[in-house]
């Protein structure tokens, strides 16, 4: 019987900004029942507080509602596991909630074939940002990326958008039914999972691009 | 106790390329964005470009674009610097640093001296 | 780029003495979500540099108090209360609002 190992805070998620939820991953259990608390202050503060909510982000987390989260603070955590023998912590770690931003996937995914007489066919793709993430404030900028493949192929083709929300892609196989996916980074943060898919059928007179 | 443990001095011939790495060890490498920075003799820091290991993602400064690529191995946890067409200019020591959840630079490698000489 | 011009360039100062670092930016480092990222480093002789203030004002983990930082938009100062002999190298200030990052010239602090 020991005391517990050292525990690593090793994940912090928000979606949007306004809260987040750090995990850490516990060390060794020493071979007794072991209790975890994490205990954290705010830049300029010398006052400890406790995790708020230990129950919304799951086993081994702590997760900050809306009036514990404050963009404009960088939070210094730390994780202490206790059992009957003693007590070990974690390394305190740095949280500035702008960089552990990962957005929702996007939203609205449609997909078009278009065929203008005068130029090569494309195809064209088009989506909106996620809901919950506010673009006006102007300090978050996402960046997109789109994956597409013939239903039945086993690799994905992957373009980067961007900032921008559509995108034309021209070298595609006619006659094949396509799946398109979408998903969204904010540029020092996270990307977000992919899209649900969206299925296009490509046309048997569909040009290949030279 | 975080560590991050660089490749050794190199030598090299303009027009070149090297490759310096950084290993990570004392915490979940995918966990943090790593930088890399560089000072060339009696100078000031510039900074290179930075990786996320969780998924190879990368930012470079525009003056290196081109030359260098940053890239990672998560089965080593180790970061790597390429940089090419070598120039007198670039010869530098140049380090690997790790943020935590943020954008600023915690914890540095010991550094790796690259000369550029013909 | 962001450019970060440190003054003096050098500074001898006697053991128990303060000392006062400045450094300007060439734009306003106060980033869009309201936080300014300008932070001060201390490379100690034949070390790799060490993280002091973050933030313009917030000590790192571990590092006496008398070192504090100061200012806002493109003005900013690094302050040692009472300088010791271990404090001796080269201070440089860096911004992480605008990428690229960029770094001051840095200051060489020596013990008279």
């Known amino acids: 019987q020991l005391p517990p190992g050292k525990p690593e805070i090793f994940k912090c998620r928000s979606p949007n900004k306004e809260t987040f939820t750090c995990w850490w991953r516990p060390g060794t259990d020493g071979g007794l029942p072991t209790n975890y608390s994490l205990t954290y202050h705010r830049e300029g503060e010398t006052l400890m507080h406790e995790c708020p909510d230990y129950i919304t982000g799951g086993p081994n987390s702590c997760h900050f509602g809306k009036q514990y989260t404050s963009m404009w603070r960088t939070y210094i955590m730390m994780v202490n596991a206790t059992n009957q023998m003693g007590s070990s912590f974690s390394d305190e770690l740095y949280v500035d909630v702008t960089y552990i931003v990962q957005p929702d996937p996007p939203l609205e995914l449609a997909v078009e074939v278009k065929q203008p007489e005068d130029r090569k066919p494309y195809l064209w793709i088009k989506w909106s940002p996620p809901t919950l993430i506010d673009l006006k404030t102007g300090w978050f900028t996402l960046l997109y990326e789109i994956r597409l493949k013939p239903e039945k192929a086993a690799e994905w083709e992957i373009h980067f958008a961007g900032q921008q929300t559509e995108f034309k892609i021209l070298s595609l196989h006619p006659g094949q039914k396509y799946l398109v996916q979408v998903r969204c980074k904010p540029d020092h943060g996270y990307w977000s999972a992919w899209s649900p898919a969206t299925f296009i059928q490509i046309p048997s007179d569909f040009t290949m691009n030279d | 106790e975080v560590q991050l443990v660089q490749s050794g001095a190199e030598v090299k011939k303009p027009g070149s390329s090297v490759k310096v790495s950084c290993k990570a060890s004392g915490y979940t490498f995918t966990s943090y964005w790593i930088h890399w920075v560089r000072q060339a003799p009696g100078q000031g820091l510039e900074w290179i470009g930075e990786i996320d290991p969780s998924d190879s993602y990368t930012n470079y400064n525009q003056k290196f674009k081109g030359r260098v690529t940053i890239t990672v191995d998560k089965s080593t946890s180790t970061a790597y610097m390429e940089l090419s067409s070598l120039r007198s200019e670039d010869t530098a020591v140049y380090y690997c640093?790790?943020?935590?959840?943020?954008?600023?630079?915690?914890?540095w490698g010991q550094g790796t001296l690259v000369t550029v000489s013909s | 780029d962001v450019v970060m011009t440190q003054t003096p360039l050098s500074l001898s100062v006697t053991p128990g003495q303060p000392a006062s670092i400045s450094c300007r930016s060439s734009?306003?480092?106060?980033?869009?979500?309201?936080?300014?990222?300008l932070h001060w480093y201390l490379q100690k002789p034949g070390q790799s540099p060490q993280l002091l203030i973050y933030?313009?004002?917030n000590r790192f983990s571990g590092v006496p108090d008398r070192f504090s930082g100061s200012g806002s938009g493109t003005d900013f100062t690094l302050k040692i209360s009472r300088v010791e002999a271990e404090d001796v190298g080269v201070y440089f200030c860096s911004q992480s609002t605008h990428v690229p990052f960029t770094f001051g010239g840095g200051t060489k602090v020596e013990i008279k």
């Open positions: 640093a790790r943020s935590f959840f943020t954008n600023w630079f915690a914890y």
């Open positions: 933030k313009v004002s």
């Open positions: 734009q306003s480092l106060v980033h869009s979500n309201g936080n300014t990222y």
